[in-house]
Amino acid sequence: SEVEYRAEVGQNAYLPCFYTPAAPGNLVPVCWGKGACPVFECGNVVLRTDERDVNYWTSRYWLNGDFRKGDVSLTIENVTLADSGIYCCRIQIPGIMNDEKFNLKLVIKPAKVTPAPTRQRDFTAAFPRMLTTRGHGPAETQTLGSLPDINLTQISTLANELRDSRLANDLRDSGATIRIG
């Protein structure tokens, strides 16, 4: 099952995906698409990076983190109900069939009429990296299959580590992370 993330209509949604480059600037091509990951690439591509830069993007979709350090988490600006669904993050690790792919489920809720509770505001203020997420963690966990027998460390998904918002300060190191080299 997909890891689930939530956002409200009108807010920005945040879908985490990370890898660790083997060396600074030694980037791996990544694509984001709307829909589950197909066998190759990403269906309905919304953003793509190559070994150097972001080389394709569409309006409202951008990388807020430092993608040169492997933070390829997707931000979707000003979401609507139509943005709900599965998103694919595919990390095209060089080699024979070494791709790692993550299906993330985005659930968009109607905007709340009442202001957010104080605790939630405190949370987003404490973790500015997640201002766009309103602190919503995944609703369920996902177990990923074993990696190909190459020089990678074990993947740990955000869902497995981030049980609730109290662990948000572990976000950077516990997202869907692949270490290369």
């Epitope: 791996v28 091509p29 698409g33 829909g35 589950a36 197909p38 066998v39 190759f40 690439e41 990403c42 269906g43 309905n44 591509v45 190559d50 070994e51 080389n55 095209q92 690790i93 060089p94 080699g95 024979i96 069939m97 070494n98 791709d99």
Partner: antibody, heavy 119, light 107 residues
């Protein structure tokens, strides 16, 4: 106009090798995943191998894994398939096919080149 | 692997008739299913991608539908040039697979 032109096919003995080429034009070659698909005489289509636009990632069908190598030269807009340890069952027309951009379909195909493995 | 079963194997129809071709997957392929047309001695030609989207330049008489495991290619009114073999392909599950094909022949 998108064009894909395969070459390099021919008659080869079992256990032999052959290198196929696919010359591409009419699109930005380096940004597209390209596949090789084959069709045995009178039979259906079988996906063989694929390579990402950068050439960094490759994919193979189990039937050819360890025997075939897919590669590309983006400076020359050319795709290759090095076929080693050929078997009679590798006899087929080999097509190169350009991915539509999303990984879920091939939108243009070459006309194919015939590989015959026979003694 | 995901097995795609096309039916019927052969469809004998006359020009102007409606053709309905089926492709059934052994497990869900979502909407990552494409249809190709192949004429003798020619390369396959993309007709439909992502289950229901017509490829560029494909006449409106071709339409695709379905999701999950059951898919249909419909040719609303057969033209003489439509008599050919039609293949479905899925790219949802590893490895990519094709159906065995449906031959649409003149009755």
């Amino acid at each position: 106009e998108v064009q894909l032109l395969e070459s390099g096919g021919g008659l080869v003995q079992p256990g032999g090798s052959l290198r196929l080429s696919c010359a591409a034009s009419g699109f930005t070659f380096r940004t597209h995943l390209i596949s090789w698909v084959r069709q045995a005489p009178g039979k259906g289509l079988e996906w063989v191998a694929a390579i990402t636009g950068s050439g960094g990632s490759t994919y193979y069908a189990d039937s050819v894994k360890g025997r075939f190598i897919i590669s590309r030269d983006n400076s020359k807009n050319t795709l290759f398939l090095q076929m080693n340890s050929l078997r009679a069952e590798d006899t087929a027309v080999y097509y190169c096919a350009k991915d539509g951009g999303s990984g879920s379909y091939d939108d243009f195909w070459g006309q194919g080149t015939l590989v015959t493995v026979s003694s | 692997e995901t097995v795609l079963t096309q039916s019927p194997v052969t469809l004998s129809l006359s020009p102007g008739e409606r053709a309905t071709l089926s492709c059934r997957a052994s497990q869900s392929v979502g909407s990552y299913l494409a249809w190709y047309q192949q004429k003798p001695g020619q390369a396959p030609r993309l007709l439909i991608y992502d289950a229901s989207n017509r490829a560029t330049g494909i006449p409106a008489r071709f339409s695709g539908s379905g999701s999950g495991t059951d898919f249909t290619l419909t040719i609303s009114s057969l033209e003489p040039e439509d008599f050919a073999v039609y293949y479905c392909q899925q790219r949802s599950n590893w490895p990519p697979t094709f159906g065995q094909g449906t031959k649409v022949e003149i009755k």
